[in-house]
Structure formats: structure tokens, C-alpha cells
């Protein structure tokens, strides 16, 4: 017997109290495959979240942060509070980045600054909480003599020398945080 | 499983604050909103405010000029400031778990009674 | 007064089918979903359905939940004398930016 469920597409589900009859996704549900007994229940965007996307018969709603927040997790399961430049959020809240270290965006760590010796080149511009330092030419390449034939070498790009660097462009990491005591730790949750 | 246990002080004088915390054990608090609801004796729910576990807050217009909410992640508590405290805050404060994606209660403290008299 | 409106009391023998009404607002029922919650005296109240229609695990099937438009119904059929409880309707609601509760049913078995 050929099961008439696989006939159904989406947006519908197939209703065994109706003899497998192909029903539409009741409102506030949506099925996004075909051959499904049940819709899904449309995620909702409220309180901290904002509506990106509605929800669809065939397709969930999609949530962005509202201002403030920044989006966590795979489809911004999570609103995570935003900081200042040359902070880092910790669980007592935002704080400033301790000397050395830098934060140049509004999520995310504290980072230590390039070390600019490790590469034989000397500090160009100072590092600050906000800014990775710059690195310049190295010493010898600024001593009186010294052939100026050759350009020197461009500095490398802030916070990627001899560090590890996030860009956080995607919205599927669960945090960027230290192990630190007060950083914030996120758990998976038994039964989300 | 989650489980919620509020602590406080059962009995406080009119016009001063009542302060009541909430501790979440067995699960994050990562992730989710936390309501204080209260019933008072012989009627129904109240809501009184959430907080999300980043910090966003939202309180009931009625009570909004009397109620702080406040979460502490690395206790995995959060808390309720109730100021200026009448007989009329007599009730049984719950403290909850919402489902931040669609908004249900599924898990809650048994409560703990609050009485406000002189 | 309760932003959502419950009759107050409801009865039925056991057995029976009794449904309870949660009527509302385009603000919160007409645009999002309803939860239902069982108080039994000197206890918690206890999710029993959320979504809508949605049940959590080990909530009996005689259980059940509708909507329609600003309405709600929570129906109980084969009534049994354990279902004497107090039953509250909620749902977000967008004006507010937050949750909204019915005033209660108490729901009596006879018999």
C-alpha cells in the first residue's frame, strides 16, 4: 500500500484523523518539507527579539536582536547584551579591557596586542583599549644608512599576528568567551 | 531537571522594600527569560516583570515605578525589588522559567508567601 | 481586572466533557499564541498547554487546546475527580511586551 503521506508538500501536513488526507498547517504552525504528520510551531520573535522574517506555512520565523543586543547560536537562539569598544562582556556585566589587551568591536573578548618584536619590527602606533597596536619597520630599518631603496613591508592587519582573531560575521558561535571565572559560560540546556 | 527556589523574608513592613531572589539549579539560566508572578490570597496571577538572561527588562506598567529585576549569571540567581511595599503586595510570589521563543512558563518555584503588616 | 476574561467557575460529573473560555485581544490572543496552566490548591500552577494546542509530556490527551480569532478554549473530556483545580489562560501580549493572564476557572467535578 503506497503511503499517500509522501504526497503532501509543504506548508501542509497529512491528517491521519482525515484518512491521510493532505491539511493545510494550522495558523501559527508551518511544515518546510513535504510528507510531514505534524507542522511545526512557528517560533515567535518578542521581548528582547525582533521579527526578521514571519513566519510562513512553509517556513519558520526568523529573529534578529533589537538594539543593544547581538544575535548567539544557530538562528539567533540567544540575544546577548552588547558592549562599548574596548570592553568585554563578563557575567558582572560590561568592563573595560585590561592594559594590553584591546576590544574593537561591540561583542566578543578582550584580545592581548600584536606583539610586534616577535616579527623584528618595532611599535609604529601604540596599542590602546579600542585599537590592536601597529607595527612598523623594524629598528635596523630605521637606522641612519639604512638603504631606503626597498618600501618597507606593509604592516600586518591588527589582532592577527602571533594571536587568534574572531571577524564574528556569523551568528553561530555561542560565544567567544575566556574561561575565566566571571566570563560568561553557555551551556546547553537540557530540554531547549 | 530545572527546578526554581525563591528566598526572602516572609514578612515586611509596609512602605519598605521586599526583596525576594530566585536560584536556578540543575540547568543554565543562559537563554531564557525569568518572571516574578504573584498571586494574592484567593485571586489570580499577576505578572510582575521578566528578565532576560542578558539583562533585558520588562516590567507590568502597573508595578513599573516600584520593580527592579535583577540576574546574577555567575550565581544562576535572579532577583525582585518590590519599593514603597502596601498591604495590597500581600501574596504568594513565584518566580519562573519562560520559553524564550515562545513564551510559556514551563517551569516554576513552589513559591514562597510574603506578608506585608506592621 | 485580567487582561484575558475566564468565567470564574465551570462544573461537570465525571465522565463528562467540559470546556473552558479565554477570551481576549487582538494584542495578545488575536496575534499570539495561548497557554494553559492547572493550579491545584497550596501549590504552583503547573504548565498544561502550551502553543495553542501543544502538551507537555505527561499531560493526559483528555487534555486539549484551541483557538479561534481573540478566543481560546481548554477542553477536558472523561472528566475525573483529580481535574478539581483551578485553570488559568495566558498569552503574550504585544502592547504590553509581555505575558497576560485570564482571572481563573475554578473547575468543580460533582458527584
Known amino acids: 500500500l503506497q503511503d499517500l503521506c509522501s504526497n503532501c508538500p509543504a506548508g501542509t501536513f497529512c491528517d491521519n484523523n482525515r484518512s491521510q488526507i493532505c491539511s493545510p498547517c494550522p495558523p501559527n504552525s508551518f511544515s518546510s518539507a513535504g510528507g510531514q504528520r505534524t507542522c511545526d510551531i512557528c517560533r515567535q520573535c518578542k521581548g528582547v527579539f525582533k521579527t526578521r522574517k514571519e513566519c510562513s506555512s512553509t517556513s519558520n520565523a526568523e529573529c534578529d536582536c533589537i538594539s543593544g543586543y547581538h544575535c548567539l547560536g544557530a538562528e539567533c537562539s540567544m540575544c546577548e547584551q552588547d558592549c562599548k569598544q574596548g570592553q568585554e562582556l563578563t557575567k558582572k556585566g560590561c568592563k573595560d579591557c585590561c592594559f594590553g589587551t584591546f576590544n574593537d568591536q561591540k561583542r566578543g573578548i578582550c584580545r592581548p596586542w600584536t606583539n610586534c618584536s616577535l616579527d623584528g619590527k618595532s611599535v609604529l602606533v601604540n596599542g590602546t583599549k579600542e585599537r590592536d597596536v601597529v607595527c612598523g619597520p623594524s629598528p635596523a630599518d630605521l637606522s641612519p644608512g639604512a638603504s631606503s631603496a626597498t618600501p618597507p613591508a606593509p604592516a600586518r592587519e591588527p589582532g592577527h599576528h602571533h594571536h587568534h582573531h574572531h571577524d564574528y560575521k556569523d551568528d553561530d558561535d555561542k560565544g567567544d568567551y575566556k574561561d575565566d571565572d566571571d566570563k560568561i559560560d553557555y551551556k546547553d540546556d537540557d530540554d531547549k | 531537571q530545572v527546578q526554581l527556589q525563591e528566598s526572602g523574608p516572609g514578612l515586611v513592613k509596609p512602605s519598605e522594600t521586599l526583596s525576594l531572589t530566585c536560584t536556578v539549579s540543575?540547568?543554565?539560566?543562559?537563554?531564557?527569560?525569568w518572571s516574578w508572578i504573584r498571586q494574592p490570597p484567593g485571586k489570580g496571577l499577576e505578572w510582575i516583570g521578566y528578565i532576560y538572561y542578558s539583562g533585558f527588562t520588562n516590567y507590568n506598567p502597573s508595578l513599573k515605578s516600584r520593580v527592579t529585576i535583577s540576574v546574577d549569571t555567575s550565581k544562576n540567581q535572579f532577583s525582585l525589588k518590590l519599593s514603597s511595599v502596601t498591604a495590597a503586595d500581600t501574596a504568594v510570589y513565584y518566580c519562573?522559567?519562560?520559553?524564550?521563543?515562545?513564551?510559556?512558563?514551563?517551569?516554576w518555584g513552589q513559591g514562597t508567601t510574603v506578608t506585608v503588616s506592621s | 481586572q485580567s487582561v484575558l476574561t475566564q468565567p470564574p467557575s465551570a462544573s461537570g460529573t465525571p465522565g463528562q466533557r467540559v470546556t473552558i473560555s479565554c477570551s481576549g485581544s487582538s494584542s495578545n490572543i488575536g496575534s499570539n499564541t495561548v497557554n494553559w496552566y492547572q493550579q491545584f490548591p497550596g501549590t504552583a500552577p503547573k504548565l498544561l498547554i502550551y502553543?495553542?494546542?501543544q502538551r507537555p509530556s505527561g499531560v493526559p490527551d483528555r487534555f486539549s487546546g484551541s483557538k479561534s480569532g481573540t478566543s481560546a478554549s481548554l477542553a477536558i473530556s472523561g472528566l475525573q475527580s483529580e481535574d478539581e483545580a483551578d485553570y488559568y489562560c495566558a498569552g503574550w501580549d504585544d502592547s504590553l511586551n509581555g505575558p497576560v493572564f485570564g482571572g481563573g476557572t475554578k473547575l468543580t467535578v460533582l458527584g
Open positions: 540543575g540547568g543554565s539560566i543562559s537563554g531564557y527569560y
Open positions: 519562573t522559567r519562560d520559553h524564550s521563543h515562545y513564551y510559556y512558563m514551563d517551569v
Open positions: 502553543s495553542n494546542n
